[in-house]
Interface confidence: low
Amino acid sequence: ESWEPCVEVVPNITYQCMELKFYKIPDNIPFSTKNLDLSFNPLRHLGSYSFLRFPELQVLDLSRCEIQTIEDGAYQSLSHLSTLILTGNPIQSLALGAFSGLSSLQKLVAVETNLASLENFPIGHLKTLKELNVAHNLIQSFKLPEYFSNLTNLEHLDLSSNKIQNIYCKDLQVLHQMPLSNLSLDLSLNPINFIQPGAFKEIRLHKLTLRSNFDDLNVMKTCIQGLAGLEVHRLVLGEFRNERNLEEFDKSSLEGLCNLTIEEFRLTYLDCYLDNIIDLFNCLANVSSFSLVSVNIKRVEDFSYNFRWQHLELVNCKFEQFPTLELKSLKRLTFTANKGGNAFSEVDLPSLEFLDLSRNGLSFKGCCSQSDFGTTSLKYLDLSFNDVITMSSNFLGLEQLEHLDFQHSNLKQMSQFSVFLSLRNLIYLDISHTHTRVAFNGIFDGLLSLKVLKMAGNSFQENFLPDIFTDLKNLTFLDLSQCQLEQLSPTAFDTLNKLQVLNMSHNNFFSLDTFPYKCLPSLQVLDYSLNHIMTSNNQELQHFPSSLAFLNLTQNDFACTCEHQSFLQWIKDQRQLLVEAERMECATPSDKQGMPVLSLNITCQMNKT
Amino acid sequence: QKHYWVCNSSDASISYTYCDKMQYPISINVNPCIKLKGSRGLLHIFYIPRRDVKQLYFNLYITVNSMTLPKRKEVICRGSDDDYSFCRALKGETVNTTVSFSFKGIKFSKGKYKCVVEAISGSPEEMLFCLEFDIIHQPNSN
């Protein structure tokens, strides 16, 4: 093809010419190309009008092209270019007009390009620029040059992993002249020692990220004090898991936050044996979203303080016991992957709508009712990947629930009453791998709105699927894989008029019967892979519903013998539905073992007597 | 397939081969070398990724003396405010990082362990690299 050796991803639009040892821009790519990846080619030098042949370009990736020189007007013809990526080029000479002509540029990535200063970076005319990423460079001064006043659309400025040590009032002067309130600034991994008090006074940012910046608690403390007067929608403070510098910190370290206006706060990877959460976070009592990730927390009773948080996130923290949570305004609580505190204790969260308690190894002595969570507003509840959850109430007071996830927790008493009877609004239910043994036909009674039911990895009495789905008239997705099923009631799916996806894989069915599926007018996907299907269990195989588009019968134990000729022929007739048909292989007889079923030519003659 | 030696410890010998076509060079150092009976140390990685590292996860396929364990998925980078600094690494950017590790040992039987590490990243998801580690375990060696 004309574009070779490049790869045509989307004809006339997207071409990938990565790592092809090109020394110059290829000339066999269509004029109409919009996305061009030339990364990892030794281009070394970009002269004027280098891309004249690609006037429609919107995305140009020049990562690691060993580019040392970019001349005036190198991109002059690219008036539609919105993204230019220069990552990993050892640029030594950048002409003043290097980026001229880029009248639509929105994203400029100049990561690891030997950039030593923003002052000499010739981008002042790029008025459309929304994102400037100059991370992993040699920039020492945080002074935002005067030309920034032209960049009125700037939303993201990434200066992480540079060499910035000091931030002075004059550095941010230009921001006072700009109507930016949407700017996100990332200064992580700069060795910041000093922020002059007042430097951020009356500046508004959307997000400020300061992670692994300080190698000393006192420096961190004085720098936070130096942020006084800043108004920021989201502040992210802390360290990276692989870039740890700070010792155990104390409450005085964060006192400077009292002088900031913050809407959302996140603290990550700091070792603080928090003795008193109120003292530590009293400056953050009024933020709307509060997040702690990988922080050691000891005394936890203080979460009952009058914090006005609407979203609380506690992830991978260490607790001694499950915290007492009494937060009147809280709407969302994410409490996941925490250590310690193995028994759930009641919380009082009257405004709560979203609760994620997954991956904590928690045990619940009684689940679930309004009294457990102190709310009647709950819509989302995730209790997955926990320990033993004993079902003792059928969600009284939690009738608003729409999403319920128990997967990989150990559910007890599931077959003693209709556990979900109250949940008329539930749309999503996952009880996969919960050690549930279905021995009660009313298990799913009440789930009138349910659309998705995942129950893989459980078991049924006598390995028989009974009529348990009677109420699920709105179900569209049903996963019954890995349930050790051997048989099913012919009327098991009778009421599932809206069912589109049915997964019966990884069970112990020995024969295939189309009868139970004839009443599924919306069925599109039926997965019977990884069973032991040898044949059909009746001579007259019906047709599957006409809606069926995908039938997976791979990895079964097909018997490729004369007595099953009609079944094998029927399979061939379904060829247009079959998924990965080449993986449907004969298991018996031994001389045909491993042969693809569809390639068989079985000609059977009557035995002569 | 060329084997790249990583290290030897008192109870293990570790090497790897590439299990993808590309075989983009990756440098791995472990100090001190992993002991299967339990150890802690530093893993140093030097790598230039051929795609953005964001939303990185590993598929782990572990084989113990030819017996395959179920696939494990380990999410490393979720996409924003990530745990590790290298999660923000872009295609073509040098990743030169040290990650501490520690694990309490479990008793492993003597033999050969294979661990295929498929690194998947980006959006749309594609393979970043694939390494097949060979770990020869000699529990009683000194």
Partner: antibody, heavy 118, light 107 residues
């Protein structure tokens, strides 16, 4: 309200080991904070000796490191100080205290005088 | 270790008078400095934390200031019950250290 109470012999012979216990009420010593020993020779200033963290970790004043042990008995909710090879200069009022989160000491026992003399 | 030097060692003051005690650290300790009051035969009592933050229940005549290496404890209008020895303590790093103390006596 947390309360701390030191106890132990008021007289110890030179070269012997001084042993004191601090009984804590109103808060579990494994529930948080760190638990410290401070001493004050008669008519002199205060000297910090060391602590045991709620996790069991200990740290000591380098000047005493070779002679000091701090341990705990969680079942009795108390922690103890042992100072070996004592001499007359170890004569002091010994205080136990609880550290707050800024390495400050808001809660102290009332102190117990230990005299080293033969 | 960080050495704290307190001055004066001793002060004799008349009631209602202002008392100023200084504490100097051998290296910068930010504001990780706390003040204690100790009356005869009593254990020390925390007065001021982080150089200038009053502890609840402590009379408002006690105040603190300073940052870095130089700190001051001020008793604005001395009362008879304030007769005691006052100690500064740094919490910047272990080992924790105390100043030598300032004894305040009522004339």
């Amino acid at each position: 309200q947390v309360q701390l109470q030191e106890s132990g012999p008021g007289l110890v012979k030179p070269s012997d080991t001084l042993s004191l216990t601090c009984a804590v009420s109103g808060y579990s010593i494994t529930g948080g904070y760190s638990w410290h020993w401070i001493r004050q020779p008669p008519g002199k200033g205060l000297e910090w000796m060391g602590y045991i963290h709620y996790s069991g970790y200990t740290d000591f004043n380098p000047s005493l490191k070779t002679r000091i042990t701090i341990s705990r008995d969680t079942s009795k909710n108390q922690f103890s100080l042992k100072l070996s090879s004592v001499t007359a200069v170890d004569t002091a009022v010994y205080y136990c205290a609880r550290k707050d989160s800024g390495r400050l000491l808001p809660y102290w026992g009332q102190g117990t005088l230990v005299t080293v003399s033969s | 270790e960080i050495v704290l030097t307190q001055s004066p060692d001793f002060q004799s003051v008349t009631p209602k008078e202002k008392v100023t005690i200084t504490c100097r650290a051998s290296q910068s300790i930010s504001d990780h400095l706390h003040w204690y009051q100790q009356k005869p035969d009593q254990s020390p009592k925390l007065l001021i934390k982080y150089a200038s933050h009053a502890i609840s229940g402590v009379p408002s005549r006690f105040s603190g200031s300073g940052s870095g290496t130089d700190f001051t404890l001020t008793i604005n209008s001395l009362e008879a019950e304030d007769a005691a020895t006052y100690y500064c303590q740094q919490g910047h790093s272990f080992p924790l250290t105390f100043g030598g103390g300032t004894k305040v006596e009522i004339k």
